[in-house]
């Protein structure tokens, strides 16, 4: 008698290793004999597909060499025209030993930045990934974490993070090891001991001492009044990544001496600077009551920044105020070459107006300081990152006390526009027509940035401005 098909052995989940054989059995009782078709993920498997073998009147489906992509739901459908078609489904789970698909590579990273060593894996069950540093398993902590992807992330890289690393991928079927890679930590040039300022008699010998460190070990050059040192002898020694340089001078004129430590990171250089003044005791004769005088600015560095024919205050505590103040600006100006294009024009305006203050002539010529609000705008909006670095240098004593004009002004100590509109000077317009910006950069990092930061852009303003904040 005709009998509708019945599947007597329903399909079950089959586990198979890659490159092995996997077989699904779909035993059917019926009369007449049924037609049996197979699907994978609801797509019909063709009888002539050479990756499969279909035998026993279609009741056995064999995958001849399992691939990772064979994972899925397999169904057999039996139909003999009597009653309805019947179906049974089962899953194929492809098991796979761990395999490292993206191994880690050698990394050179600057101290304080974030390092990521990749380690992307395949396998089923999903392999767990751990890391070995040197010969020991690597412990995770607040800085060091193994990401979901298996990659190793190290925040705020430290010198002690340097070394040899490998990743290990493990599951129930086996273990895979990556090749050993090297993490090299480079460190910005940093001055450990800055040269000290001296007030000496004419014809004295003075030794200026400058010590710096960094990875690679930096080189030290000396600058005298903005130019390479023309006289004097330099002695250098290097020990434990610390370079020690001594400049011996025969003093015949006052000067500003700068120690510059430089090291290379790929194509980029990092520099650290510290300056000292050499003054000659008899040269400086400030008048008792009068600390300076008003004169038209005749220098070069601040030409583009100060108003034409600006009346500036020249400080007579310097032997040659015009030259000394111009030197201060020149030295500080060179520092600004490394800051971002957003910060530089604002910082230049602040610097020139800070060192060559507007002068109020009268019986006692008086310097007019910058208005507090303008100082804050430069500090917090245009140069937030750079200001932190400058303040850090000032606190660490990399700017000597005699060099107080080189350190950044303390905005809070400057007079406000609200007190007396004539008591403080406004900076020229700070409009550089860059991108639209609307939010402040987070003011947390005190490390110098190698690259100019990407400032956030906004869409809700109808004009272009440059800093990370502009008006209210």
């Amino acid at each position: 008698l005709p009998k509708a098909p019945v599947i007597t052995t329903p399909l079950e989940t089959v586990d198979a290793l890659v490159e092995e054989v996997a077989t699904f059995m779909c035993a059917v009782e019926s009369y007449p004999q049924p037609e049996i078709s197979w699907t994978r993920n609801k797509i019909l498997i063709k009888l002539f597909d050479t990756r499969y073998s279909i035998r026993e009147n279609g009741q056995l489906l064999t995958i001849l060499s399992v691939e990772d992509s064979d994972d899925g739901i397999y169904c057999c459908t039996a139909n003999n025209g009597v009653g309805g078609a019947v179906e049974s489904c089962g899953a194929l789970q492809v098991k796979m030993k761990p395999k490292i698909t993206r191994p880690p590579i050698n990394v050179k990273i600057i101290e304080g930045l974030k390092a990521v060593l990749p380690c992307t894996t395949m396998g089923n069950p999903k392999p767990s990934v751990s890391w070995i540093k040197g010969d020991s398993p690597l412990r995770e902590n607040s800085r060091i974490a193994v990401l979901e992807s298996g990659s190793l992330r190290i925040h705020n890289v430290q010198k002690e993070d340097a070394g040899q690393y490998r990743c290990v991928a493990k599951n129930s079927l086996g273990t895979a090891y990556s090749k050993v890679v090297k993490l090299e930590v480079e460190v910005f040039a940093r001055i450990l001991r800055a040269p000290e300022s001296h007030n000496v008699t004419f014809g004295s010998f003075v030794t200026l001492h400058c010590t710096a460190t960094g990875i690679p070990v930096p080189t030290i050059t000396w600058i005298e009044n903005g130019n390479a040192v023309s006289s004097g002898s330099i002695q250098e020694s290097v020990k434990d990544r610390v370079i020690d340089s001594r400049l011996q001078l025969f003093i015949t004129k006052p000067g500003l001496y700068t120690c510059i430590a430089t090291n290379k990171h790929g194509e980029k250089f990092s520099t650290a600077k510290a300056a000292a003044t050499i003054s000659i005791a008899e040269w400086s004769k400030p008048q008792k009551d009068n600390k300076g005088y008003c004169a038209q600015y005749r220098g070069e560095v601040c030409n583009a920044v100060l108003a034409k024919d600006a009346l500036v205050f020249l400080n007579t505590s310097y032997a040659d105020p015009e030259e000394a103040q111009e030197l201060l600006v020149h030295t500080a100006w060179n520092e600004l070459k490394v800051v971002s294009p957003v910060c530089r024009p604002a910082a230049e305006a602040l610097l020139c107006n800070h060192i060559f203050q507007e002068c109020s002539p009268g019986v006692v010529p008086t310097p007019i300081p910058i208005c507090r609000e303008y100082c804050l705008a430069v500090k917090e909006l245009f140069c937030a990152k750079e200001w932190l670095v400058m303040e850090e240098k000032t606190h660490r004593g990399l700017y000597r006390s005699e060099m107080h004009l080189l350190s950044v002004p303390e905005c809070s100590k400057l007079p406000s526009m609200h007190w007396d509109p004539t008591a403080c000077a406004r900076l020229p317009h700070l409009d550089y027509n860059k991108e639209n910006l609307k939010t402040f950069p987070p003011m947390t990092s005190s490390k110098p940035s190698v690259d100019i930061p990407n400032l956030p852009s906004s869409s809700s303003s109808s004009f272009s401005v440059s800093p990370t904040y502009s008006m209210t």
């Epitope: 208005c371 507090r372 609000e373 303008y374 804050l376 705008a377 917090e380 909006l381 245009f382 406000s416 526009m417 609200h418 406004r426 317009h429 700070l430 409009d431 639209n436 910006l437 609307k438 939010t439 402040f440 950069p441 987070p442 003011m443 947390t444 906004s458 809700s460 303003s461 109808s462 004009f463 401005v465 800093p467 990370t468 904040y469 502009s470 008006m471 209210t472």
Partner: antibody, heavy 124, light 107 residues
Framework: EVQLVESGGGLVQPGGSLRLSCAAS????????IHWVRQAPGKGLEWVAS????????SYADSVKGRFTISADTSKNTAYLQMNSLRAEDTAVYYC?????????????????WGQGTLVTVSS | DIQMTQSPSSLSASVGDRVTITCRAS??????VAWYQQKPGKAPKLLIY???SLYSGVPSRFSGSRSGTDFTLTISSLQPEDFATYYC?????????FGQGTKVEIK
């Protein structure tokens, strides 16, 4: 003495237009930033728009963008707020206020002088 | 956009009390924060600018301070004329945000 006087408020139907004026004296509009701030009945302060004449730069709150236009006539020392496509939710007292300095520093000086306000009622 | 969350929304205090009102910025901001006093039917008055600078003519019992993203207005000894609504205000890039206001009432 610094003074700001608003005018131009009144009753207008939804979809209608109004132009508010803010006449300044005791300082020059060109050297300051001018702002419009509104206050719906029984509610808090809400910034509407700002202009810095020295730059010809303007900015608007999202709620009014595309409908309101802020401008200034430095020869008349007056700022304006052109309000189009008015809605019931624009009903408020509109204040004009100034802050010292250009757009970068005015945030640090605060809105130091305010007008007495002008009432705008949008209702059918 | 930066939000300024002001707390409390209202408070009751007596003459002579020390009163503290706080504004918390939703993200890192500059010190371009001001505080205003507003009385019913009147325009707001500037009290504090640049987070901590006292505006000219404002009594010294008012002071402002900053700690990270928290800005505080303190009235050291409340006077009868100080009962009003106080607002903080932050200036972003051409974007001004006010706090919701704090109403200081007589206990």
């Amino acid at each position: 003495e610094v003074q700001l006087v608003e005018s131009g408020g009144g009753l207008v139907q939804p979809g209608g237009s109004l132009r508010l004026s803010c006449a300044a004296s005791g300082f020059t509009v060109s050297s300051s930033s001018i702002h419009w701030v509104r206050q719906a009945p029984g509610k808090g302060l809400e910034w509407v728009a700002s202009i810095s004449s020295s730059y010809g730069s303007t900015s608007y709150a999202d709620s009014v963008k595309g409908r309101f236009t802020i401008s200034a006539d430095t020869s008349k020392n007056t700022a304006y707020l052109q309000m189009n496509s008015l809605r019931a939710e624009d009903t408020a007292v509109y204040y004009c206020a100034r802050s010292e300095g250009d757009r970068y520093v005015s945030g640090y000086s605060g809105l130091d002088y305010w007008g007495q306000g002008t009432l705008v009622t949008v209702s059918s | 956009d930066i939000q300024m969350t002001q707390s409390p929304s209202s408070l009751s205090a007596s003459v002579g009390d020390r009163v503290t009102i706080t504004c918390r910025a939703s993200q890192s901001v500059s010190s371009a924060v001001a505080w205003y006093q507003q009385k019913p039917g009147k325009a707001p008055k500037l009290l504090i600018y640049s987070a901590s600078s006292l505006y000219s003519g404002v009594p010294s019992r008012f002071s402002g301070s900053r700690s990270g993203t928290d800005f505080t207005l303190t009235i050291s000894s409340l006077q009868p004329e100080d009962f009003a609504t106080y607002y903080c205000q932050q200036s972003g890039v051409w974007l001004i945000t006010f706090g919701q206001g704090t109403k200081v009432e007589i206990k």
